[in-house]
């Protein structure tokens, strides 16, 4: 999917009321310097490219993320401000019902949600120069 | 089963405003945008806007913005449209409809609809 | 915003024949159109959605195609309760928008 037509002050302003919150929540009790961030972005629409893969594909040791309150929340921001967005969600809607899993917090998707964390705000600062 | 009713018929005077209710049941109220729909006098339906409990926040068609309020209670499973500054074009049935915004992604059921009058 | 034709406006049937409805929307907006029955007095009811998904509940007499700017809705044998007002909508993008209705009427 194509992010380059989304509608990224929205989302911008659903990440910083509601979604942010949510990461925070997930990662509390975890120092803020415990995982270094790897994962980057070079602009809104890869930056959400990022997103979407972090939060929505299963990894090698943590495959629960998209039941987590946070990962609901992306995927409607991008369903709403996203043109075409949720026509590409059908299949992976119904796939993702069928290998529904019990929600684990696993030490890798702490550190896969800190690099969540890390690459939202790169997208809220699309100005700045790379590191 | 799913049910989205709301309140009763209204008649305003131009200039007033007029809050119509949409109370939801028979589904989780968060995972659905409740949307909403108006239809003057044989005409075609129109697109006003949008609530999202889950975001806790609206999208409104240009046309109505700075006079249309969208909200819900989400204690309530009820959702809310305020219309201001009434005028007698704005005299027709609104709907609303719930659209699911983590699945299915369409409008897939709707109240019975509320008739607004806008007369002198 | 994505603007969506009807046509035609009204479609004079009797009982029995095929309908075929067509919607052409300003922009390419892939499979994102749904289409809509509404009767008198009633609220629309969900025929279609994505273009050709069906419903359950609802009749396997109405079938829907098309993608990009074209979209059919075809009713293969018109039942005396299928005369009404059906619309395209799209939800493509923001702000999400309906066609301006084609009537379906007793010949």
């Known amino acids: 999917y194509d992010f380059t037509n989304c509608d990224f002050e929205k989302i911008k302003a659903a990440y910083l009321s509601t979604i942010s919150k949510d990461l925070i929540t997930y990662m509390s009790g975890t120092k803020s310097t415990e995982f270094n961030n790897t994962v980057s972005c070079s602009n809104r629409p890869h930056c959400l490219t990022e997103i979407q893969s972090l939060t929505f594909n299963p990894t090698a040791g943590c495959a629960s993320l998209a039941k987590e309150m946070f990962a609901m929340k992306t995927k409607a921001a991008l369903a709403i401000w996203c043109p075409g967005y949720s026509e590409t969600q059908i299949n992976a809607t119904q796939a993702m019902k069928k290998r529904r899993k019990r929600k684990v917090t696993t030490n890798k998707c702490l550190e896969q949600v800190s690099q969540l964390q890390g690459l939202w705000r790169r997208f809220n600062r699309p100005l700045l120069k790379q590191q | 089963q799913v049910q989205l009713v709301q309140s009763g018929a209204e008649v305003k005077k131009p200039g007033a405003s007029v809050k119509v209710s949409c109370k939801a049941s028979g589904y989780i109220f968060t995972d659905y945008a409740m949307h909403w729909v108006r239809q003057a006098p044989g005409q075609g339906l129109e697109w006003m806007g949008t609530?999202?409990?889950?975001?806790?926040?609206?999208d409104y068609a240009q046309k109505f913005q700075g006079r249309v309020t969208m909200t819900a209670d989400t204690s309530t499973s009820t959702a809310y449209m305020e219309l201001r500054s009434l005028r007698s074009d704005d005299t027709a049935v609104y709907y609303c409809a719930r659209m699911g915004v983590t699945h299915s992604y369409v409008m897939d059921a709707w109240g019975q609809g509320t008739l607004v009058t806008v007369s002198s | 915003e994505i603007v969506l034709t009807q046509s035609p406006g009204t479609l004079s049937l009797s009982p029995g024949e095929r309908a075929t409805l067509s919607c052409r929307a300003s922009?390419?907006?892939?499979?994102?159109v749904h289409w809509y029955q509404q009767k008198p007095g009633q609220a629309p009811r969900l025929l279609i959605y994505f273009a050709s998904q069906s419903i359950s509940g609802i009749p396997d007499r109405f079938s829907g195609s098309g993608s990009g700017t074209d979209f059919t809705l075809t009713i293969s044998r018109l039942e005396p309760e299928d005369f009404a007002v059906y619309y395209c909508?799209?939800?493509?993008?923001?702000?999400?928008?309906f066609g301006q209705g084609t009537k379906v009427e007793i010949k």
């Open positions: 609530f999202i409990p889950l975001l806790d926040t609206s």
């Open positions: 909508q799209q939800t493509f993008s923001l702000p999400y928008t």
């Open positions: 922009q390419p907006i892939s499979i994102s």
